[in-house]
Interface confidence: low
């Protein structure tokens, strides 16, 4: 025997106390699937949350975070304070990255600079609080004759003869 509630569409609920009549969801509630026996309360985007999508009778509200904050967790369940690049959020607020670490985003933690020597490479560009180091090529990557440690002579300026 088919469940009469299965005929109730999204946006309604099956009212057991009224002979399985499909009744519309009450205010500030929704049912996203058919056959529901109750409607779920709409999410309210309050405080640091702001409404990205309004609740309808068939779908929940969606929240994001006010400027200066970013979403964390499934469906933006939490808002966390932004920090500047080169910082990380601690219990005491935003703190600069320690030497040897960096953060190139407004969220997340400071991460250690890449250790170029682990791959047999040299540091081409030093790291900062905001940027990772840039590793240079390893000797094996260099073309023949380019492995001299002697820096190349500077180019002469045009129009000047050697002394």
């Amino acid at each position: 025997l088919q469940d009469p509630c299965s005929n109730c569409p999204a946006g309604t609920f099956c009212d057991n106390n009224r002979n399985q009549i499909c009744s519309p969801c009450p205010p500030n509630s929704f049912s996203s699937a058919g056959g529901q026996r109750t409607c779920d309360i709409c999410r309210q985007c309050k405080g640091v949350f702001r409404t990205r999508k309004e609740c309808s009778s068939t779908s929940n509200a969606e929240c994001d975070c006010t400027p200066g904050f970013h979403c964390l967790g499934a469906g933006c369940s939490r808002c966390e304070q932004d920090c500047k690049q080169g910082q990380e959020l601690t219990k005491k607020g935003c703190k600069d990255c320690c030497f040897g670490t960096f953060n190139d985003q407004k969220r997340g933690i400071c991460r250690p600079w890449t250790n170029c020597s682990l791959d047999g490479k040299s540091v081409l560009v030093n790291g900062t609080k905001e940027r990772d180091v840039v590793c240079g090529p390893s000797p094996a990557d260099l073309s023949p004759g380019a492995s001299s440690v002697t820096p190349p002579a500077p180019a002469r300026e045009p129009g000047h003869s050697p002394q």
Partner: antibody
């Protein structure tokens, strides 16, 4: 037949945490919400909070910092935890099923909680 | 929060009397109002939901009316088993709130 049965400690000391369980039979917690209501001696009914079929909760704003409502669908149990108890929390505590149009169609018999040292 | 005020807080009536209990909301709640009956032993039952819809198994002598901020529960002919305290409850906005109750006794 749908039944709700509250079970609690009876006597709790001030500053301790109250833990009450509502066991639901004949009805699925994935289809209905459960609301907690209390009644101090000689006073009216006060709504505490609700847990929805999906597991989300709403609380009485005045008690929000002290309340936690959770559930175990597989055991058909809903629990209420209230911290930092005072004598003012002495009451009969009820759980009630919330049906689709948000009325409480089935109530438990209630469990008496006395906060005293 | 929406405040619900019931009047009178208690009343005494004779068997067969028509009894009315009032419930007032601090702001408009459309028809989102329920009525409950609490017997002297503490048992609570739903009587009426959505202002005027009788819950299954509730005698037809109970009826509800109103809209917006003012609502009424009526018992057309008071019976001995109606001795109880009656509560209104709004569900227009969370948190859902109850009226203070009306205690009904037999003269």
């Amino acid at each position: 037949q749908v039944q709700l049965q509250e079970s609690g400690p009876g006597l709790v000391k001030p500053s301790e945490t109250l833990s009450i369980t509502c066991t639901v039979s004949g009805s699925s917690l994935t289809s209905y919400g459960v609301h907690w209501v209390r009644q101090p001696p000689g006073k009216g009914l006060e709504g505490l909070g609700v847990i929805w079929p999906g597991g989300s909760t709403n609380y009485n704003s005045a008690l929000m910092s002290r309340l936690t409502i959770s559930k175990d669908n597989s055991k058909s149990q809903v629990s209420l935890k209230m911290s930092s108890l005072t004598a003012a929390d002495t009451a009969m505590y009820y759980c009630a099923r919330v049906t689709g149009t948000w009325y409480f169609d089935v109530w438990g018999q209630g469990t008496t909680v006395t906060v005293s040292s | 929060d929406i405040q619900m005020t019931q009047s009178p807080s208690s009343l005494s009536a004779s068997l067969g009397d028509r009894v009315t209990i009032s419930c007032s909301a601090s702001q408009g709640i459309s028809n989102y109002l329920n009525w409950y009956q609490q017997k002297p032993d503490g048992t609570v039952k739903l009587l009426i939901y959505y202002t005027s819809t009788l819950h299954s198994g509730v005698p037809s002598r109970f009826s509800g009316s109103g809209s917006g901020t003012d609502f009424t529960l009526t018992i057309s002919s008071l019976q001995p088993e109606d001795v109880a305290t009656y509560y209104c409850q709004q569900y227009s906005k969370l948190p859902w709130t109850f009226g203070g109750g009306t205690k009904l006794e037999i003269k």
